[in-house]
Amino acid sequence: WPPPGTGDVVVQAPTQVPGFLGDSVTLPCYLQVPNMEVTHVSQLTWARHGESGSMAVFHQTQGPSYSESKRLEFVAARLGAELRNASLRMFGLRVEDEGNYTCLFVTFPQGSRSVDIWLRVLAKPQNTAEVQKVQLTGEPVPMARCVSTGGRPPAQITWHSDLGGMPNTSQVPGFLSGTVTVTSLWILVPSSQVDGKNVTCKVEHESFEKPQLLTVNLTVYYPPEVSISGYDNNWYLGQNEATLTCDARSNPEPTGYNWSTTMGPLPPFAVAQGAQLLIRPVDKPINTTLICNVTNALGARQAELTVQVKEGPPSEHSGISRN
């Protein structure tokens, strides 16, 4: 707000007033009269820059008159009262209402006093964020989508992630005239390491008190990545039972595990239990390559592990034994 005048009457008003599309807004405007100063106000006038004529007038004897009587109203000016408050209410804000307005007091003996106010017409956008489910492609593809619908002015969208990625942002007119829908895609080369990770879409708009943060949980569909664990290269005759685990990461989840060897079916000492393979104690050395084949909706992948059960002094090793 401009500082009060010293020794002269001054019109006080904010330089800018925000209002929301479809809502009502008050353009505040007051005449500040210093203590020792005397003034008589006979008319209050509102005019819009670039338009001919005044949109609202409050006349000392004629009262209020409006260019659009259903959309405008002096909020405080009354016949028979001192005219010090020219604040004007506008109803059903439209995009075309945005602009510069002059509030003017016709005073005696000081003359006319006026101030300009910029009316900003805003529309609060609706924001959504969604995952774009992708498969391994080897090239950058949109993995998340953030949409800010019907904002005025257009919302600002940024992405926050420690995965890298590049935004691709575009705008189209919104459903309501003068509004804008902003769509931002977050683009990255899909990999299994990205699956299940989060990225955050940050939407900023002058109608928000603080930015809106929308989290997207990324989805990458990929065939199983398979490894076998549980073998430490240190198996000896006389050991207890041991278990191998077929470790598979995939999206969607594995639908089946199949254990075999390079020679064909499993030997008797190996018993398949889903993702696990139970190795029973043996009484003679073995050297076998085991295969775990994992299937999901996108295909099958396998891992191989060569297992040796060696002879060794039982006193030094726990060994695989029948007990």
Epitope: H40, S42, Q43, T45, S54
Partner: antibody
Framework: EVQLVQSGSELKKPGASVKISCKTS????????MHWVRQPHGKGLEWIGG????????SYNQRFKGRVTLTVDKSTSTAYMELSSLRSEDTAVYYC?????????WGQGTLVTVSS | DIVMTQSPSAMSASVGDRVTITCKAS??????VAWYQQKPGQPPKALIY???YRYSGVPDRFTGSGSGTDFTLTISSLQAEDLAEYFC?????????FGQGTKLEIK
């Protein structure tokens, strides 16, 4: 009904002064500024100045400053305009007019003739 | 001082005609313009304030328009009783000034 009734015609010699009255009725005198406008015969209108009855605040056209004095008598709701050092070119009809930014009510006019 | 230049200075028109009087201000006066009608032997009568708003009781055939420096008074259908002189006036700043007048005669 708002009425502004002015005093009668005046014939004055050059160098003299004239004081015209404007008695008001039908509204609250102190709520409106009173202004004075003159019109030479067959010519346009010229604003002289105005006074607010409540505060006594005045505004004058610089062309008349020093020669014109505006006063009011709140007790009788009457405004006065005195013009001194009259010259022949001051011959005109003088109007009081109630100010609402524009002038919504006017007196009937007082003809002042300055002639030697 | 702000100069208000009115045109034409005189005109004659027939009953039923559309009549337009213009007033040009030497500087921007916003919408702080009034129009007056003065019949012979009478004081001026206020018609329009704030450039485009009619005083109550003024026939709607009288229309004011404009802002800034260019203003117009239009009589949409001239009546015999509209025989008068018409003045514009600015009240944007002191000293208040009037146009020189437009004398309207009926043919």
């Amino acid at each position: 009904e708002v009425q502004l009734v002015q005093s009668g015609s005046e014939l004055k010699k050059p160098g003299a002064s004239v004081k015209i009255s404007c008695k008001t009725s039908g509204y609250t005198f102190t709520e409106y500024t009173m202004h004075w406008v003159r019109q030479p015969h067959g010519k346009g209108l010229e604003w002289i100045g105005g006074i607010h009855p409540n505060s006594g605040g005045t505004s004058y056209n610089q062309r008349f400053k020093g020669r014109v004095t505006l006063t009011v008598d709140k007790s009788t709701s009457t405004a006065y305009m005195e013009l001194s050092s009259l010259r022949s070119e001051d011959t005109a009809v003088y109007y009081c007019a109630r100010w609402t930014g524009d002038f919504d009510y006017w007196g009937q006019g007082t003809l002042v003739t300055v002639s030697s | 001082d702000i100069v208000m230049t009115q045109s034409p200075s005189a005109m004659s028109a027939s009953v039923g005609d559309r009549v337009t009087i213009t007033c040009k201000a030497s500087q921007n006066v916003g919408t702080n313009v009034a129009w007056y009608q003065q019949k012979p032997g009478q004081p001026p009568k206020a018609l329009i304030y704030s450039a485009s708003y009619r005083y109550s009781g003024v026939p709607d055939r009288f229309t004011g328009s404009g802002s800034g420096t260019d203003f117009t008074l239009t009589i949409s259908s001239l009546q015999a009783e509209d025989l008068a002189e018409y003045f514009c006036q600015q009240y944007q700043s002191y000293p208040y000034t009037f146009g020189q007048g437009t004398k309207l005669e009926i043919k």
